[in-house]
């Protein structure tokens, strides 16, 4: 999905209004020291393609983050203000259902929403270019 | 937790540029904007601009975009500011200070200041 | 570039009560519902350090006598009872829009 055509301003008023919450509640107890964040993004279309494949894509030691609180209204921000997002994910989500599992909070998960935290600190704070 | 160390005190003369450097410890350094904000004796604080250290992405407040330059060293957790073609009106001390965790913009974590001072 | 106005540049106020500061934006600093305004208070020779986000929002650790309101252009920092430590200088900040700017600072005082 291409997320050029979003409306950034809306889905960072999401975000910082309930998504981050979340992000902290799934963190707690944890430093915010404890993982280095490694993943960035360039621009705010590149970190929602960055924040979309980290929310919603398995990988390896944590594949159970879809099913979040953060992801889903991740998921809902994105269905109404990128234009055309829920129709790209009928598929993906139908596939997700078929291999849905237990919620188990691995270390790996963790380093996963750091990163992710990373991600959204960066495509709420672009630095502005003055014209 | 995170601290932000600034380098020492300064004296320059008017012409002559100055090299703040501001070193990061305890965290993460590379996915935050850092900012440079100066204040003047008695006065308030001035925004300088910003960079992040993941790209080197820069942005800087107009009015002192030909005379500031911002840095990054990743490897070292530090950020450097530049002001060149100093005046006296440049004497003031110099802030680091990193934003939040959250993406809020608001600066949590600042540097303990340098002093700069420009005088013939 | 959004220029930030405080009032009153200096306050004095008695131990116990209600000190109010204002903050007035050239331009609206709210997006979409939110309002781009931060809260720092300064003590002589510390930086400064933030007092609330987004306009009524308490930074970490911050007693909860500190209190904001406001959006659009018309913000207001409010510190119900006054106590010793809080003799300061308080600042407003935008961060909408580049530059980001702050408030000509108010100072504090006790009666």
């Known amino acids: 999905y291409d997320f050029t055509n979003c409306d950034f301003e809306k889905i960072k008023a999401a975000y910082l209004s309930t998504i981050s919450k979340d992000l902290i509640t799934y963190m707690s107890g944890t430093k915010s020291t404890e993982f280095n964040n490694t993943v960035s993004c360039s621009n705010r279309p590149h970190c929602l393609t960055e924040i979309q494949s980290l929310t919603f894509n398995p990988t390896a030691g944590c594949a159970s983050l879809a099913k979040e609180m953060f992801a889903m209204k991740t998921k809902a921000a994105l269905a109404i203000w990128c234009p055309g997002y829920s129709e790209t994910q009928i598929n993906a989500t139908q596939a997700m259902k078929k291999r849905r599992k237990r919620k188990v909070t691995t270390n790996k998960c963790l380093e996963q929403v750091s990163q992710l935290q990373g991600l959204w600190r960066r495509f709420n704070r672009p630095l502005l270019k003055q014209q | 937790e995170v601290q932000l160390v600034q380098s020492g005190a300064e004296v320059k003369k008017p012409g002559s540029s100055v090299k703040v450097s501001c070193k990061a410890s305890?965290?993460?350094?590379?996915?935050?904007?850092m900012h440079w904000v100066r204040q003047a004796p008695g006065q308030g604080l001035e925004w300088m601009g910003a960079?992040?250290?993941?790209?080197?992405?820069?942005s800087y407040n107009q009015k002192f975009k030909d005379r500031v330059t911002i840095t990054a060293d990743k490897s070292t957790s530090t950020a450097y500011m530049e002001l060149s073609s100093l005046r006296s009106e440049d004497t003031a001390v110099y802030y680091c200070?990193?934003?939040?965790?959250?993406?809020?913009?608001?600066?949590?974590?600042w540097g303990q200041g340098t002093t700069v001072t420009v005088s013939s | 570039d959004i220029v930030m106005t405080q009032s009153p540049d200096s306050l004095a106020v008695s131990l116990g009560e209600r000190a109010t500061i204002n903050c007035r934006a050239s331009e609206s600093v709210d997006n979409s519902g939110l309002s781009f305004m931060h809260w720092y208070q300064q003590k002589p020779g510390q930086p400064p350090k933030l007092l609330l986000y987004r306009a009524s929002n308490l930074g970490s650790g911050i007693p909860d006598r500190f209190s904001g309101s406001g959006s659009g252009t018309d913000f207001t920092l409010t510190i119900s009872s006054l106590q010793a430590e809080d003799v300061a200088v308080y600042y407003c900040q935008q961060i909408n829009t580049d530059p980001l700017t702050f408030g000509q600072g108010t100072k504090l005082e006790i009666k």
């Open positions: 305890g965290g993460t350094f590379s996915t935050y904007n």
């Open positions: 960079i992040y250290p993941g790209n080197g992405e820069t």
């Open positions: 200070a990193r934003e939040d965790d959250y993406g809020e913009g608001y600066f949590d974590v």
